[in-house]
């Protein structure tokens, strides 16, 4: 079936704001009045794995950007990257898995964990200006948890 | 070789709890999910829910208040509970491994046990 | 949920025949289609997947076709081991669903 997607932003439980930080970097930070507009805008696709009762895989494409969340494994530690794509053949519905993430819903916030590296987040440092980054830890001091703002597309 | 083999009781009290086991040989549970299906006498085929390798389960609307899916990674074996049964839930129960082809099919179930006939009758 | 509607639900043919069965989605599923057949007694034996991908071992008179929302599935010379009920399933998006069936009875 055709790939169905919303256009969102993110923000951690500490409500810092995503951003691009450099061409294939996200950082978290605070942001306020017009500079919300620097916050990146998430086309996210629903797409097939292992989806249950509790987990959705989506898709974490940027919005009108060939760039997708994607992990992979560098120097033998799962990690965050954004990977650039065909803008012909993505979004799909049959997403590669190091491009899915298990979209968790838990007391009315999110967390994303990762599809090819199970227990590892989506997360931010408590620290403001810091990179986004996959974390194997829940419930420490980095920040595995987000809300979701729907925008319009 | 795959293979799967369903087993349980044949009879089942009405309102009592439905067990069966699926033991499996040939693939990993922790590589694959396995699904359940069920066929009343003569009709047709129902997919009832999966648990995937990491332990997930998705289970179909109309059962999930009544249905619970585990597994047993070391002795291969998936178990199915159904609680308060009901004559309609009289079947033929399948379990059956999933694909789990990432990026090209991911829920087709390819290898079926032969399936074990339950009687919901007092 | 997917409503899957396959027809028809029971058809007499003769050996050497040439058959056919639909089977149509109630929204886009892509390619993702499947067919089993099976016979009395027995589990389904998968036969086709991902819409016409034959799997290993199954003769090739056995077919699939269609994408999308619509989808066929044909016996192109029925032998006497063909007799049996198939059926659809989509594999789309949970839950999955399959068809009604189709009794492919001899003649």
């Known amino acids: 079936a055709p790939v169905r997607s919303l256009n969102c932003t993110l923000r951690d439980s500490q409500q810092k704001s995503l951003v691009m930080s450099g061409p294939y970097e996200l950082k978290a930070l605070h942001l306020q009045g017009q500079d919300m507009e620097q916050q990146v805008v998430f086309s996210m696709s629903f797409v097939q794995g292992e989806e249950s009762n509790d987990k959705i895989p989506v898709a974490l494409g940027l919005k009108e950007k060939n760039l997708y969340l994607s992990c992979v494994l560098k120097d033998d530690k799962p990690t965050l990257q954004l990977e650039s794509v065909d803008p012909k053949n993505y979004p799909k519905k049959k997403m590669e898995k190091r491009f899915v993430f298990n979209k968790i819903e838990i007391n009315n916030k999110l967390e994303f964990e990762s599809a090819q590296f199970p227990n590892w987040y989506i997360s931010t440092s408590q620290a403001e200006n810091m990179p986004v980054f996959l974390g194997g830890t829940k419930g420490g001091q980095d920040i595995t948890d987000f809300t979701m703002q729907f925008v319009s597309s | 070789e795959v293979q799967l083999q369903e087993s349980g009781p044949g009879l089942v009290k009405p309102s009592e709890t439905l067990s069966l086991t699926c033991t499996v040989s040939g693939f990993s549970l922790r590589d694959f999910g396995v699904s359940w299906i069920r066929q009343p006498p003569g009709k047709g085929l129902e997919w009832i829910g999966l648990i995937w390798g990491g332990g997930d389960t998705y289970y179909n609307s109309p059962l999930k208040s009544r249905l619970t899916i585990s597994k047993d990674n070391s002795k291969s074996q998936v178990s199915l509970k159904l609680s308060s049964v009901t004559a309609a839930d009289t079947a033929v129960y399948y379990c059956?491994?999933?694909?789990?082809?990432?990026?090209?099919?991911?829920?087709?179930?390819?290898?079926w046990g032969q399936g074990t006939l339950v009687t919901v009758s007092s | 949920d997917i409503q899957m509607t396959q027809s028809p639900s029971s058809l007499s043919a003769s050996v050497g025949d040439r058959v056919t069965i639909t089977c149509q989605a109630s929204q886009d599923i892509d390619m993702d289609m499947n067919w089993y057949q099976q016979k009395p007694g027995k589990a389904p034996k998968l036969l086709i997947s991902l819409g016409n991908i034959l799997r290993p071992g199954v003769p090739s008179r056995f077919s699939g076709s269609g994408s999308g929302t619509d989808f066929t599935f044909t016996i192109s010379s029925l032998q006497p081991e063909d007799f049996a009920t198939y059926y659809c399933?989509?594999?789309?998006?949970?839950?999955?669903?399959f068809g009604q069936g189709t009794k492919l009875e001899i003649k």
């Open positions: 399933l989509q594999s789309d998006s949970f839950p999955l669903t």
């Open positions: 059956a491994k999933v694909r789990n082809l990432w990026g090209y099919d991911m829920y087709t179930m390819d290898y």
